[in-house]
């Protein structure tokens, strides 16, 4: 079989910051040394781009200093974390992997992770 | 809009070049990467080149590995197609495709017609 | 490689009618990594269907694909006057990108 297979967690709860953390997880059918990981945000059959990082593997995760994403590589599997998430985010969010180089060229697409974020309740104004 | 929009094909005797370009508009150029398609007249899709986001990777047809290349300018949201050595059997028009965030392709130029021929 | 293999290379249908267009690989190719085009003559393909299964936008529900593995579907359910063309599946899930040679549906 050519395709490549991602795993990621059905459900992640995020914290009450409004921080979500899951693995995804490939398995590689060749020796990648330059991979591509992506988080998309699909909602309503409309897919857009989250973030995204390429590494070296064997090297740290970079994200652009602007992203909301962090990561941490180990292998062939990603620590990806969202950060900055309030209520009107929640929503199916996909990871997406591409080995870039050496060839051939894979694509690799998860499931999708139901991310729910709940926005805290305001802190009610205390009398003294 | 959200488009693709090809230029550069023409008349070419064999063993002669011709530069194609694609100019994208309306969604984030360096996002997305690209591809070049082929259809000689009366037959099938071919694919012909991929281009990653920043331009580093290229991957190539068989039949085109070694004559043509790849290229992007992200800060001009366009796509590069330098053809050398042209082959009668290069005849088609030569489309420029977007590769999607889940992978299709999406989004397709109108083409642009190359006829190699004395 | 993955070879696409298309059938049938012709299929004469009346309006109204269903069409059943048949794609098959010579390896197994994820479901996520199948795509159905249409192109209408003198025109740019179309996406229709991708990840086997999931239309694109702005493609109307008479049109659904299905299968995994090596067998894919592609099925029109009525056929209007506008979807006489020729069609395409499309493997994207390994290089090299690879698509077959094409169904035409024409009037019958």
């Known amino acids: 079989c050519k395709a490549m297979h991602v795993a990621q967690p059905a459900v992640v709860l995020a914290s009450s910051r409004g921080i979500a953390s899951f693995v995804c997880e490939y398995a590689s059918p060749g020796k990648a040394t330059e991979v591509r990981v992506t988080v998309l945000r699909q909602a309503d059959s409309q897919v857009t781009e989250v973030c995204a990082a390429t590494y070296m593997m064997g090297n740290e995760l970079t994200f652009l200093d602007d992203s909301i994403c962090t990561g941490t590589s180990s292998g062939n599997q990603v620590n990806l974390t969202i950060q900055g998430l309030r209520a009107m985010d929640t929503g199916l969010y996909i990871c997406k992997v591409e080995l870039m180089y050496p060839p051939p060229y894979y694509l690799g697409i998860g499931n999708g992770t139901q991310i729910y974020v709940i926005d805290p309740e305001p802190c009610p104004d205390s009398d003294f | 809009e959200v488009q693709l929009v090809e230029s550069g094909g023409g008349l070419v005797k064999p063993g002669g070049s011709l530069r194609l370009s694609c100019a994208a508009s309306g969604f984030t150029f360096s996002s997305y990467t690209m591809h070049w398609v082929r259809q000689a007249p009366g037959k099938g899709l071919e694919w012909v080149s991929f281009?990653?986001?920043?331009?580093?990777?290229?991957y190539y047809a068989d039949s085109v590995k070694g004559r043509f290349t790849i290229s992007r300018d992200n800060a001009k949201n366009s796509l590069y197609l330098q053809m050398n050595s042209l082959r009668a059997e290069d005849t088609a028009v030569y489309y420029c495709?977007?590769?999607?965030?889940?992978?299709?392709?999406?989004?397709w130029g109108q083409g642009t017609m190359v006829t190699v021929s004395s | 490689e993955i070879v696409l293999t298309q059938s049938p290379g012709t299929l004469s249908v009346s309006p109204g009618e269903r069409a059943t267009l048949s794609c098959r690989a010579s390896q197994s190719v994820g479901s996520s990594y199948l795509a159905w085009y249409q192109q209408k003559p003198g025109q740019a393909p179309r996406l229709l269907i991708y990840?086997?299964?999931s239309r694109a936008t702005g493609i109307p529900d008479r049109f659904s694909g299905s299968g995994s593995g090596t067998d894919f579907t592609l099925t029109i359910s009525r056929l209007e006057p506008e979807d006489f063309a020729v069609y395409y599946c499309q493997q994207y899930g390994s290089s090299p990108w690879t698509f077959g040679q094409g169904t035409k549906v024409e009037i019958k």
């Open positions: 281009i990653s986001y920043d331009g580093n990777t290229k």
């Open positions: 990840g086997a299964f």
């Open positions: 495709a977007r590769g999607g965030l889940l992978g299709p392709f999406d989004l």
